[in-house]
């Protein structure tokens, strides 16, 4: 499956929206930095099959959607930007779903990519626990926004790599 160019553009648009969502000076949040343990190995295109990487991307976008769809998230961010962000994520989910099913049969996906999906879920679980521990403070959300931007950037670079390998 050749990930469409529109997917890469969508990812870039999502990153731009995330960048625009900042509300407070990030400089006041330095002490709130946290090691979320981004599962970089899951997205390593050299180690994993293409279908696994795509599946992990899909899970990451799904989890990002879930994270930013919460009541606490709605209170933290600008509603208009958040709605635009949802649309971009939804479009990417559709692109990736088509891609995953094309790569391997639907039945095999769940078994084959269980570990990578679990790693991504645990990563987002750590993010959620961090937010809860910080009582969803503005700085906690800033740190999470920066972390999601970094993981999106990382996966965007990998998707470029996957397209080149085709």
């Amino acid at each position: 499956c050749d990930l469409p160019q529109t997917h890469s553009l969508g990812n870039r648009r999502a990153l731009i929206l995330l960048a625009q969502m900042g509300r407070i000076s990030h400089f006041s949040c330095l002490k709130d930095r946290y090691d979320f343990g981004f599962p970089q190995e899951v997205f390593d295109g050299n180690q994993f099959q293409k279908a696994q990487a795509i599946s992990a991307f899909h899970e990451m976008i799904q989890q990002t959607f879930n994270l930013f769809s919460t009541k606490d998230s709605s209170a933290a961010w600008d509603e208009t930007l958040l709605d635009k962000f949802y649309i971009e994520l939804f479009q990417q989910l559709n692109d990736l779903e088509a891609c995953v099913t094309q790569e391997v049969g639907v039945e095999e996906i769940a078994l084959m990519n269980e570990d990578s999906i679990l790693a991504v879920r645990k990563y987002f679980q750590r993010i959620t626990l961090y937010l809860m521990g910080k009582k969803y403070s503005p700085c906690a959300w800033e740190v999470v926004r920066a972390e999601i931007m970094r993981s999106f950037s990382f996966s965007t670079n990998l998707q470029k790599g996957l397209r080149r390998k085709d």
Partner: antibody
């Protein structure tokens, strides 16, 4: 390859203005902050301030607040440090360095080669 | 502001020696502590970040430890290229502050 390339050495007179630059390459310029560090002759490192090139938000050390201005032009991946009126005490080596912002990653992992500023009448 | 105090300010050692430099913060900085090496006429180089993480490409003879207010940089077996000035820096909060430096000289 990540690189921060600074502008060349400057010799200025007291009261003159100056703007030095730091150009980033080999990475996403707006994904990292750029900090500025001063080192006076034979002395230690002093943090001056920092900029987030994505939105040009800045933070300064109280010692340098009002003395210098930090800016950035993300379209050309360049950060700047400027003085409106130099003093002899501004004579120093100035370094730029990249900072991961709010991400859990190494601070100041890449540095520019430094710009020597000499202020003398 | 958080004050960073390094000791000693200078030391003389021989190749192969084990060298220890300490850094004390005026308040708890958890593990937000970095160590840099600077050679004359060169830009500083990051050695250790978050108190104990070795920066990529840095030899394993360098190690960092500590948390809260007291931190240590250890060079297990000093090499000729290690003669330089070492700085600690807190990254917990602005303004970011450096220690005054420790110069490691040849005995």
């Amino acid at each position: 390859e990540v690189q921060l390339v600074q502008s060349g050495a400057e010799v200025k007179k007291p009261g003159e203005s100056l703007k030095i630059s730091c150009k980033g390459s080999g990475y996403s310029f707006t994904s990292y902050w750029i900090g500025w560090v001063r080192q006076m002759p034979g002395k230690g490192l002093e943090w001056m301030g920092i900029i987030d090139p994505s939105d040009s938000d800045t933070a300064y050390s109280p010692s340098f607040q009002g003395q210098v201005t930090i800016s950035a032009d993300k379209s050309i991946s360049t950060a700047y440090l400027q003085w409106s009126s130099l003093k002899a005490s501004d004579t120093a080596m100035y370094y730029c360095a990249r900072h991961p912002g709010l991400n859990w990653a190494p601070d100041f992992d890449y540095w520019g080669q430094g710009t020597l500023v000499t202020v003398s009448s | 502001d958080i004050q960073m105090t390094q000791s000693p300010s200078s030391l003389s050692a021989s190749v192969g020696d084990r060298v220890t430099i300490t850094c004390r913060a005026s308040q708890s900085i958890t593990n937000f502590l970095n160590w840099y090496q600077q050679k004359p006429g060169k830009a500083p180089k990051l050695l250790i970040y978050f108190a104990s993480s070795l920066q990529s490409g840095v030899p394993s003879r360098f190690s960092g430890s500590g948390s809260g207010t007291d931190f240590t940089l250890t060079i297990s077996s000093l090499q000729p290229e290690d003669f330089a000035t070492y700085y600690c820096q807190q990254s917990l909060d602005f303004p970011l502050t450096f220690g005054q430096g420790t110069k490691v000289e040849i005995k």
